[in-house]
């Protein structure tokens, strides 16, 4: 059917059609993070809740060990929001002291890992300088886009600093994907 | 079909398939808000435009009295952006006066109401401290994710302060949902 | 099928069904911008990468000359993220000098152009005041929503200041659309 108008219905090719309710889908929500090792120059990956509350995985989309496993090749919409919170960033303290004020930052990366490829691929990045005047700050970073994924690909969410992630509510920090 | 590769086309099960153009969908846009009562500890819900300009509802997805009504059970992608604007937040004034500087904040919540359950469920929350140096500030909060909804569920968008919502343009503040 | 439950499968109407993998889709990523003319009171449009790296167009969704061309009428989900970065905004400099402090701002607009209609239509806008204390700042603006588009419509992304767009990484600044 690609690249042309639909033929008359008696010529219609039905084979690739599939029930929408049968497509791989997942919505994962934040959990308290347990300290884990991560490589020095690599942002740590978040753990997720996959079944409690609003979280679910279905139709062979499985979550295991920080990764969403892609069960079927196709185009997926992938999204995540991470809410960060912290005390006054060093930036403003440094500024008051008259030293050069390189701002702190918060970053979220949605990363794809393909076993046949040595390096992870960064699919989406949201990064923001944080140089707040107030003593306590909080803010979300939202990401979402469509990508062509292969069966066996793995998705994870990495953040610049796990200790700044707000894990208190499942509606504040989440990660999901669905086959289009 | 769930959990297995597609059988040859002559064995294909067609019953659950449905035309994509037939799925419930809505994109609502901001309107000027009329003052309405809301419970003391609950964020007020926004009114929306459902048919003028870019706004639409279709295929039994109806909008009524601040709510989007879910006409069919399934997995929906739900999204909203609210653009806030205000004068200098009290935070910076308080700070200048040497008082403790708890930051002001802006919050958007997409909430699900189920008649059979007494409490609304918060599906998505975007919350941000506002402690701006400039005298006039403005910024959007965007949310979007997938949820399993039941026929009869109702969706609304709540905000921390209706008076800060930018209602001037339909492209700045909006709310939508569609069945996947 | 609209507005009613599915009839028994032997009565099923198949004509409007179509393979999901056959739907128009595109994910475009940032490239370095070449200076181009734009009308004085109109935000400049971004150029995009359409085939290298994570970028793709498929199923008659084509990219040409800053525009995504819509090949088929229907409801599309459209999204974009633009990451901005800059030096200290004038806002804080003006403030220090005691002059009135109208904040600078950053804005992203997803615009629809219809040949039969003289004026472009702004579908989505994300706009944010920038009044940073730090000397270097960076932050994303994300947008996404569903719109009913017509065959022949063209989509573009406009920004308030091209020189502030971070074009260094394909995961930071992107633009996409897919038929639902």
């Amino acid at each position: 059917l690609k690249g042309q108008e639909f033929a008359p219905s008696h010529q219609q090719v039905y084979a690739p059609l599939r029930a929408d309710g049968d497509k791989p889908r997942a919505h994962l929500t934040v959990v308290r993070q347990t300290p884990t090792q991560h490589f020095k120059n690599q942002f740590p990956a978040l753990h997720w809740e996959h079944e409690l509350g609003l979280a679910f995985t279905k139709n062979r989309m499985n979550y295991t060990n920080k990764f969403l496993l892609i069960p079927e090749s196709g185009d997926y919409f992938i999204y995540s929001q991470v809410t960060f919170r912290g005390m006054t960033s060093e930036c403003s303290e440094i500024r008051q002291a008259g030293r050069p004020n390189k701002p702190d930052s918060i970053t979220v990366v949605i990363t794809k890992v393909t076993d046949s490829y040595p390096e992870p691929t960064q699919l989406l990045m949201g990064t923001k300088s944080v140089c707040e005047v107030g003593s306590n700050w909080f803010q979300p970073i939202y990401l979402g886009a469509m990508f062509s994924l292969q069966e066996g690909d793995k998705l994870m969410v990495n953040v610049s600093d796990i200790s700044l992630v707000d894990y208190t509510k499942e509606d504040k920090t989440f990660f999901g994907a669905f086959l289009l | 079909l769930k959990g297995q590769e597609f059988a040859p086309s002559h064995q294909q099960v067609y019953a659950p398939l449905r035309a994509d153009g037939d799925k419930p969908r809505a994109h609502l846009t901001v309107v000027r808000q009329t003052p309405t009562q809301h419970f003391k500890n609950q964020f007020p819900a926004l009114h929306w435009e459902h048919e003028l300009g870019l706004a639409f509802t279709k295929n039994r997805m109806n909008y009524t009295n601040k709510f989007l009504l879910i006409p069919e059970s399934g997995d929906y992608f739900i999204y909203s952006q609210v653009t806030f604007r205000g004068m200098t937040s009290e935070c910076s004034e308080i700070r200048q006066a040497g008082r403790p500087n708890k930051p002001d904040s802006i919050t958007v919540v997409i909430t699900k109401v189920t008649d059979s359950y007494p409490e609304p469920t918060q599906l998505l929350m975007g919350t941000k401290s506002v402690c701006e140096v400039g005298s006039n500030w403005f910024q959007p909060i965007y949310l979007g994710a997938m949820f399993s909804l039941q026929e009869g569920d109702k969706l609304m968008v709540n905000v921390s302060d209706i008076s800060l919502v930018d209602y001037t343009k339909e492209d700045k503040t909006f709310f939508g949902a569609f069945l996947l | 099928l609209k507005g009613q439950e599915f009839a028994p499968s032997h009565q099923q109407v198949y004509a409007p069904l179509r393979a999901d993998g056959d739907k128009p889709r595109a994910h475009l990523t940032v490239v370095r911008q070449t200076p181009t003319q734009h009308f004085k009171n109109q935000f400049p449009a971004l150029h995009w990468e359409h085939e290298l790296g994570l970028a793709f167009t498929k199923n008659r969704m084509n990219y040409t000359n800053k525009f995504l061309l819509i090949p088929e009428s229907g409801d599309y989900f459209i999204y974009s993220q633009v990451t901005f970065r800059g030096m200290t905004s004038e806002c804080s400099e003006i403030r220090q000098a005691g002059r009135p402090n109208k904040p600078d701002s950053i804005t992203v607009v997803i615009t629809k152009v219809t040949d039969s209609y003289p004026e472009p239509t702004q579908l989505l806008m994300g706009t944010k005041s920038v009044c940073e204390v730090g000397s270097n700042w960076f932050q994303p603006i994300y947008l996404g929503a569903m719109f009913s588009l017509q065959e022949g419509d063209k989509l573009m992304v406009n920004v308030s200041d091209i020189s502030l767009v971070d074009y260094t990484k394909e995961d930071k600044t992107f633009f996409g659309a897919f038929l639902l």
């Epitope: 929500t29 959990v31 308290r32 993070q33 347990t34 753990h47 997720w48 809740e49 079944e51 409690l52 509350g53 609003l54 295991t64 060990n65 920080k66 894990y167 208190t168 509510k169 499942e170 509606d171 | 359950y117 409490e119 469920t121 918060q122 599906l123 | -």
Partner: antibody, heavy 123, light 107 residues
């Protein structure tokens, strides 16, 4: 440290309702990082998970299919405890009943457990 | 539902022995596997969580390994206080499920 203290009768008549309570100290029944569970142990069935209550965006309950029609688990935020009610009991419900916190932090596990209550169903 | 099959159901060993207990799941779930020790008249106590992480206060002679469907609990050198029953448990999906237990007895 977190402790769970169980209370409730050890003898219940057939067709009546088994009721147990689990008092929590050192944590909150409303914690978003825990679920609050009832588990029973008998020689015939081994360790059998019965159900749980927990709060995320709202209070949620999940129950084992084997007891779903008869079980209720309720949180009591004012007393920081949770309870088990099992209706229409039969002698097959005779077991040691435990309450347990499941820590939810990516991985999840039961810790701590209550001291256990031997419930005998007999007339 | 995920079924957990533990083996052996009972085991006789001596102080100082190295002992291995295995647990097999009916479907794969990576590392969502916990091990508990239970002494007579007492509640189970957590030994190992997430397949291989040692619970605070548990002696280092206990270790866990495995991923997917096959998991192992090893006691490197049995001590008198280790004679008890041991249970595996999956925490990946609801309902939670346990192995039927391994009773470790003195030879």
């Amino acid at each position: 440290q977190v402790q769970l203290q169980q209370s409730g009768p050890g003898l219940v008549k057939p067709s009546q309702t088994l009721s147990l309570t689990c008092a929590i100290s050192g944590d909150s029944v409303s914690s978003s990082s825990a679920t609050w569970n009832w588990i029973r142990q008998s020689p015939s069935r081994g360790l059998e998970w019965l159900g749980r209550t927990y709060q995320r965006s709202k209070w949620n309950n999940d129950y084992a299919v084997s007891v779903k029609s008869r079980i209720t688990i309720n949180p009591d935020t004012s007393r920081n405890q949770f309870s088990l009610q099992l209706n229409s009991v039969t002698p097959e419900d005779t077991a040691v009943y435990y309450c347990a916190r499941e820590v939810v932090a990516g991985p999840r596990w039961f810790d701590p457990w209550g001291q256990g209550t031997l419930v005998t169903v007999s007339s | 539902d995920i079924q957990m099959t533990q083996s052996p159901s009972s085991l006789s060993a001596s102080v100082g022995d190295r002992v291995t207990i295995t647990c097999r799941a009916s479907q794969s779930f990576s590392s969502y596997l916990n091990w508990y020790q239970q002494k007579p008249g007492k509640a189970p106590e957590l030994l190992i969580y997430a397949a291989s992480s040692l619970q605070s206060g548990v002696p280092s002679r206990f270790s866990g390994s495995g991923s997917g469907t096959d998991f192992t609990l090893t006691i490197s050198s049995l001590q008198p206080e280790d004679f008890a029953s041991y249970f595996c448990q999956q925490s990946y999906s609801t309902p939670r499920s346990f192995g039927q237990g391994t009773k470790l007895e003195i030879k």
